[in-house]
Every structure is written in C-alpha cells, then in structure tokens.
Interface confidence: low
C-alpha cells in the first residue's frame, strides 16, 4: 500500500524531502518552476500503491512587450519576461505620452501599451478614398489647422464635406465618392 | 463618464495616518495610473505618487518614508496612506487620473 | 525644478489680452497648465505646452520651450475668472507652478 518515486510532471519540482517510500494517504506538493504558475491542486496523495492527482503548470510569462511606435523602452529588456514583470516605455521627442507609461506581463498577456502621439498636433498625408483624389499636392506632414479638399472621378458624385480638416494630429472625416444611380 | 469618488476622514489626529480611498468608474485600474495630489494654502499643489497600470509606484522623494499607495484593480480602488501626519499636512489631498507623461486629466473631489 | 509664476495676481477687463508666464530652475520637455475656481477641484487646461484640453475654447494658447512656458487668452471673459497653474514632469517629482490668479474688471 505504500507509494515509490514520485511521478514527475513538466515544470512541476516536488517540495519537502524526497524519500525513497511514502505511506498510505502521505501529501507531496509541487510548487512551479519559474515563469509557471500552478494550475488547479498542487498535491499529490499516496493511495493504494498509485499516487493521485495531476499537478499542471501553466507557462504564464510573456515575450516581446508590445511594439509602441516613436517610443523606446527604458526598463531592462529580458527574452522571457514572468508575470507580473512590468516594463516602461518613453516617447521620443517630440511625441507625448498618451496612456499609462508602463505595461505588466499578466499571465501570459501583456495589459495595454500606451500610445505616442504628436504633440504638436500635425498631421500625415489625407486619407485616401476610393474614386476620388484631392486636389492638391499630397505632403508628407500638413500642420495643424491646415485643409485640403477632394475631387471625385468623372461620373461619380460627391456625398459629405469636400475639405477636411488637420485637428490634433487627426483628419476630420473625408467625403465618399458614389456611382449615381442609372435608371 | 469617468469619475473619482474619494472617500476618508476629514480630520487626523497629530502623529496618526491618514487613509483615502479613491473608487473609480467608467476606466480600468488596469490601464491607467492614478495620481495623488495634495494642495495647501502654505505650499501650493504638491505631487505625491502614482501608481501605475501595472502596479508599481513612484513616491516623491520628500514623502517616500511615509507614504504608501496600491490598489485592486477587481475593485476599481486606489488605497492612499500617510502616516505621521503634523499640523502641516493639513491640506486638501486629490486623486486624479494619468494622462501622460505625469500629467492628470480627471480629478477627484478633494479630502480635506 | 521650481516654477515661478508671474504674475500671481492679475485683472483684466473682458476682451483684453492676457499672458501668463511660468519659469522654470532648469530646462524641461514640456508644460502643461490647470485652471482651478473657488471650491472645485483643478482642471486640465493645456498639456504637453501647446494642445488644448477637451472644451478648452479657442481663446486660449500655450507656447514656449526651455525654461520658459506662456498661457496666453487672445481676449478675456468673464468665465475665464480662474486661478492657472503650470506643471512640468520632465523630472520627478512633477512640480507646479505657485499660480496666476485672473480676475475680471
């Protein structure tokens, strides 16, 4: 009735001291290696010559933290990073902050970077639309308060405003081009 | 919309803490930091910590040895306390949201 | 990093142009500015020097760079009756400014 070695399960290390012979209903926990964390019961318990129960551990670290454009991160970067690891981030100049500076390795996902926005409020080339261009010469940065306006492709009709604004680093909404109805 | 109720006493006792507690609403503790601030008539607005989305926190130097902020993001609180508290703390003492870069968009009503 | 307002106290009659100046002990990245009234807590007003705060009007403006930082309103009124206060967090601890108390003629 009693029990021999102790079964072995992945990234599971047994605790306390190993014996070569566990009586009838003696516990043995298992504790994680590092970057698991225990999933369900920890133990395992001697019963009729067969241990019973089934420790799991679950990988719960996270790789790669999140890519945040015009920004760097300023904490020690790590191939695999445990849970509850946190890494901080900096924008690079001249864009701002927007959001929480840090993010947090939380059981296998990362919790939401932050963004880094033009502070001054520039803008990146209209958005194009279908059938339509603008009428001007597209620029690579437009600063804010600047508007361009859009022109529609022969037989297709103008629906909402022609001229968009530059507003906090945003376009305001384009029109569309539509095909008229032909009856 | 997003808001922060802050709740605590309003008066200490010399030499006591002081504890506030700041519930959120309409934003996750989870993605956002949160602020302590305190204003006087003597010193002006004065920051005291955050605490981050992911837990940490970062205490102005003149008050580390006697502040500590956490929080439970299951619960939508931010816990402040101050310990040691003299006649000049009294001040009216604020939570308020990270907006970036340590600045703060929404505040809380105020403890005096 | 100390920043010192000027000035602390000032009266304006509506329409007339105001500027605020903040100066600060050493350089920093950026300033953001707060209006607080009597008995309300303060309120995000102009961050990151330059960009409006949601439902700022238009009035208002900021600039600078360096070590010195302006809040200008192109034309007071009366609802513009305000403390304002500056605030940099190029370096911790984040610090503010003493404060501008506006008030109307």
């Known amino acids: 009735t009693d029990c021999l070695s102790l079964p072995s399960f992945e990234n599971a290390i047994p605790m306390g001291e190993k014996k070569d012979v566990y009586k009838a209903g003696e516990q043995v926990t298992y504790t994680c290696a590092t970057y698991y964390k225990m999933d369900g019961a920890s133990n395992v318990t001697c019963i009729n010559s067969r241990w019973t129960g089934r420790p799991t551990c679950r990988d719960t670290s996270c790789v790669n933290p999140p890519t945040v454009q015009n920004a760097y991160i300023v904490s020690r970067q790590m191939s695999k990073y445990p849970s509850g690891e946190r890494v901080r981030y900096q924008c690079r100049s001249p864009y701002e902050m927007f959001g929480d500076e840090e993010v947090m390795c939380l059981n296998g996902n990362w919790t939401e970077p932050p963004q880094c926005k033009d502070s001054t409020g520039k803008c990146g080339p209209p958005p194009p639309i279908d059938n339509g261009d603008i009428t001007s010469f597209p620029l690579s940065v437009y600063a804010p308060a600047s508007s361009v306006e859009y022109q529609c492709q022969n037989l297709y009709q103008l629906e909402g405003n022609k001229r968009i604004t530059c507003r906090n680093g945003q376009w305001s909404e384009p029109p569309k081009c539509l095909h008229p109805c032909v009856i | 919309q997003v808001q922060l109720q802050q709740s605590g006493p309003g008066l200490v006792q010399p030499s006591q803490s002081l504890s506030i507690t700041c519930t959120v609403s309409?934003?996750?503790?989870?993605?956002?930091?949160v602020h302590w601030i305190r204003q006087s008539p003597g010193k002006g607005l004065e920051w005291l910590g955050v605490?981050?989305?992911?837990?940490?926190?970062d205490y102005n130097a003149a008050f580390i040895s006697r502040l500590n902020i956490n929080k439970d993001n299951s619960k939508s609180q931010v816990f402040f306390k101050m310990n040691s508290l003299q006649a000049n703390d009294t001040a009216i003492y604020y939570c308020?949201?990270?907006?970036?870069?340590?600045?703060?968009?929404?505040w809380g009503q105020g403890t005096s | 990093i100390v920043l010192s307002q000027s000035p602390t106290f000032l009266s304006a009659s509506p329409g007339e142009k105001v500027t605020v100046t903040c100066r600060a002990s050493s350089s920093v990245k950026y300033m953001h500015w707060y209006q607080q009234k009597p008995g309300a807590s303060p309120k995000p007003w102009i961050f990151a020097t330059s960009n409006l705060a949601s439902g700022v009007p238009a009035r208002f403006s900021g600039s600078g760079s360096g070590t010195s930082y302006s809040l200008t309103i192109s034309r007071v009124e009366a609802e513009d009756a305000a403390t304002y206060y500056c605030q940099q967090w190029s370096i911790i601890p984040p610090t503010f400014g003493n404060g501008t108390k506006l008030e109307l003629k």
């Open positions: 605490i981050w989305s992911g837990g940490t926190a």
């Open positions: 309409d934003f996750s503790l989870a993605r956002y930091g």
């Open positions: 308020a949201r990270n907006f970036g870069n340590y600045a703060v968009d929404y």
